[in-house]
């Protein structure tokens, strides 16, 4: 594996070459962690401490801001509860979602008293509206955590908000909620570590199962403590959880609780020299690459090791067909707290728990109509026995010999002369971005990774906590505690002044145009375009 980047650019070099634009934050704000990209309006909305920003995608130096602090009374109450006035007793924005054509929905910690509201953004970009609906505040419980240190994953679809968060002041009652809309809130089971065991939520995504929207599912990605007996000693497991979009809760024991919730472990590991696999269990971020078939996105996951002794990071890819196969497989079962987990061998009730009520897969109209045995089984068997293994059974990127860990990932699919390539932009905990291309070898999923660039995007080392990629603008947007950075997806001119250097770079965005290394456009009818991503061979492509 080529672990040395083709280009390594310091923050100073990035600035000097006009390859980074930074918004270094406001004196009275921080925590620029919550991103919402709006390509149509050409805006990046960012939720931070006491503020929501609307940045111009062309240049983030051009922005509007909304100030949304808490009242002095609320701040004092928070302080009296023993919380830190600067780090906790403020309104840290945790949810920022498109509500409809004219409004966003935003939720914040509200100084340990979660609160939500609507933000008007107008019908058209030229309306230039960006204002808080001051008259309409809502309880943010079950939407945003109380504690700004806690992670939240959320998704707003059809006027309903799905959130994985902590629903209590102490930050111990973790649940996946559905709120807003016209229905009673629905949540995961309380007081049952088999459902959720101190989870850290990463993200939530809507994925279609079939052409029938009744089959749509919401998938949550999170990491959590392994359940006793699942692993010897204390361990973390990465998870994917599913919920049917049309789950309205059950009856009897699952009234207003999910009836279709299932979870499975995500494995990202490499075989060790001693026969013991090295596991990357700490899921940090997830990116879904939708291409051609929206029912089958490729899932990119960024993982780190749990060990303090051995620090490493990896990127694993998963196929949704593998995920679905696991959810159709055996349920995890054990007869008591001191027993091992085994695949459930008994009779699985009909309709199979986890199946969405629809005309496609079964003859029942609502989760409220599920038979008692289905409800009882679903409540007792939320986990699958088999894990989801990555494509090719191994990570596509591994970093173990460095002083940083991966935190974020976004992926761009790029058309090159010799095919399509997935270019990964990986954020780290020291404020650098790695640009990595995965190059297929014999089969498309047997990949070689090439580290193209390592760029420092913030003046001081600071963990990257948010990333968005605009294909329209060909720009990358990066968030951290310190501020927001913007950089182009490609810096072809920096690769050098010769065809060989351009070709050796193996950057799918770039090709030699006869006089310079420049952006490659597949539509351009230029016979002189020299590019070889698969082999990086200048001899066959460069005549100079």
């Amino acid at each position: 594996k080529n672990n040395v980047p083709r280009l390594k650019l310091s923050y100073k070099e990035m600035l000097e070459s006009n390859n980074v634009i930074t918004f270094n934050g406001l004196a009275n704000s921080s925590s620029y962690h919550t991103f919402l990209l709006d390509e149509e309006r050409s805006r990046l909305y960012v939720g931070a401490k006491d503020h929501i920003f609307s940045f111009d995608l062309v240049n983030i130096k051009d922005f509007q801001k909304i100030v949304w602090p808490v009242s002095y009374t609320r701040r004092d109450e928070c302080k009296w509860a023993g919380k830190d006035i600067l780090k906790e007793c403020a309104n840290f924005i945790k949810v920022l979602k498109a509500y409809n054509q004219t409004h966003l929905y935003a939720c914040g910690t509200g100084a340990f008293h979660p609160i939500c509201t609507y933000i008007e953004i107008g019908h058209h970009p030229e309306d230039n509206i960006f204002k808080l609906e001051n008259s309409h505040f809502e309880n943010g419980r079950g939407k945003s955590p109380y504690d700004p240190k806690l992670l939240t994953a959320s998704l707003l679809i059809d006027g309903e908000l799905y959130s994985g968060t902590a629903a209590d002041f102490m930050g111990r009652d973790f649940a996946i909620f559905r709120t807003l809309g016209h229905h009673h809130p629905i949540r995961t089971e309380q007081h049952d570590s088999r459902w959720l065991n101190d989870p850290k939520f990463i993200s939530a995504h809507l994925i279609s199962e079939s052409d029938n929207p009744e089959d749509d599912k919401v998938y949550f990605f999170f990491r959590e403590n392994a359940i006793d007996g699942e692993h010897s000693g204390k361990a973390t497991h990465a998870r994917i959880g599913q919920i049917c979009k049309n789950d309205f809760g059950g009856h009897r024991s699952l009234v207003n609780k999910w009836t279709t919730f299932l979870k499975a472990r995500l494995i990202c590991s490499v075989p060790g020299p001693n026969g013991i696999d090295t596991h990357f269990d700490e899921l940090q971020d997830v990116f879904l690459m939708n291409f051609k078939d929206p029912k089958n996105p490729v899932v990119y996951g960024v993982f780190t090791t749990s060990s303090n002794i051995f620090k490493g990071s990896a990127v694993c890819m998963y196929s949704m067909s593998d995920v679905r196969r696991v959810f159709l497989g055996p349920y995890a079962h054990r007869d008591g707290p001191n027993y091992q987990w085994v695949p459930y061998q008994g009779r699985v009730p009909y309709p199979r728990p986890g199946t969405c009520p629809s005309k496609t897969f079964g003859g029942f109209d609502s989760t409220k109509d599920l038979p008692d045995d289905v409800i009882t089984f679903a409540r007792s068997h939320p986990a699958m026995y088999n894990p989801v293994f990555p494509m090719n059974n191994r990570p596509i990127v591994i970093k173990t010999d460095v002083n940083y860990q991966f935190t974020q990932i976004v992926v761009d699919r790029v058309d090159a002369e010799d095919g399509q390539y997935d270019v990964m932009f990986i954020g780290t905990d020291v404020g650098t971005v790695l640009k990595v291309v995965s190059i297929p070898k014999e089969t498309w999923y047997d990949l070689e990774e090439v580290l193209l660039e390592e760029m420092t995007v913030f003046r001081e080392p600071t963990a990257i906590s948010a990333m968005e990629l605009s294909t329209k603008q060909q720009q990358l947007y990066i968030g951290s505690t310190a501020g927001v950075a913007q950089l182009p997806l490609h810096r072809c001119d920096i690769y050098g002044k010769a065809c060989a250097e351009c070709c050796l770079a193996r950057d799918p965005y770039c090709a030699w145009d006869g006089s310079a290394c420049s952006r490659y456009f597949p539509t351009a009818k230029r016979a002189t375009r020299a590019q070889d991503i698969r082999n990086g061979d200048p001899l066959t492509h460069c005549s100079d």
Epitope: E77, C78, W80, A81, F112, H113, P114, N139, G140, R141, G142, Y146, A167, D168, F169, M170, R172, D173, H184, P185, R187, Q190, H191, D192, S193, R194, R252, S253, N256, R379, S380
Partner: antibody, heavy 123, light 112 residues
């Protein structure tokens, strides 16, 4: 009709033990979280302990932690409270109560109560 | 010392309206948790009167109503009747431990 019937109370010396039982009927006992709440003579209510439907979660008030043990037998529709190292301040009527979770935010309420059983700790 | 504060006693004549307050803190009622109210008639077990701040279980007369604001909640009883003479307790969630907290109770006396 939901019914909760406590038993097992009585007079016990300090340091002694008692085991309270609560027989449930009229509802699907195995589906509900159950609790013990006590009331000292002439005083207010105090939550003592709670247990989830499958015994996966168990909680205790600080005042009884390490001395009391809550358990349930779903096959017998019965809730138990094993009380050890009893003190004079444990003297109270002990109620068995069902968690209702009737509210929007799933915050526990107690929708059904037993009639209580009196525990007196005295030498 | 109860975590939720209630007045020890209130009184009112038949037909009158009385309110009972319940004050908590930012880690219980003020944290957005729901408040429930119980009525305990002399010599009997408590009975759920109001759940989720303002909802009445079936069988509870609409003379009883609940509300919540900030770190406080209140129970209002209109058209006071002799059979309303009882102890009233508020209760809130308080996180995993102590899980739930009660007010100290308020003795309602119906005069006359």
């Amino acid at each position: 009709e939901v019914q909760l019937l406590e038993s097992g109370g009585g007079l016990v010396q300090p340091g002694g033990s008692l085991r309270l039982s609560c027989a449930a009927s009229g509802f699907d006992f195995s589906s509900y979280e159950m609790n013990w709440v006590r009331q000292a003579p002439g005083k207010g209510l105090e939550w003592v302990s709670g247990i989830s439907w499958n015994s996966g979660w168990i909680g205790y008030a600080d005042s009884v932690k390490g001395r009391f043990t809550i358990s349930r037998d779903n096959s017998k529709n019965t809730l138990y409270l094993q009380m050890n190292s009893l003190r004079a301040e444990d003297t109270a009527v002990y109620y068995c109560a069902r968690s209702g979770y009737s509210s929007s935010w799933f915050d526990p309420d107690f929708d059904y109560w037993g009639q209580g059983t009196l525990v007196t700790v005295s030498s | 010392q109860s975590v939720l504060t209630q007045p020890p006693s209130v009184s009112g004549a038949p037909g009158q309206r009385v309110t009972i307050s319940c004050t908590g803190s930012s880690s219980n009622i003020g944290a957005g948790y729901d408040v429930h109210w119980y009525q305990q008639l002399p010599g009997t077990a408590p009975k759920l009167l109001i759940y989720g701040n303002s909802n009445r279980p079936s069988g509870v007369p609409d003379r009883f109503s609940g509300s919540k604001s900030g770190t406080s909640a209140s129970l209002a009883i209109t058209g006071l009747q002799a059979e309303d003479e009882a102890d009233y307790y508020c209760q809130s969630y308080a996180g995993p431990n102590p899980y739930v907290v009660f007010g100290g109770g308020t003795k309602l006396t119906v005069l006359g």
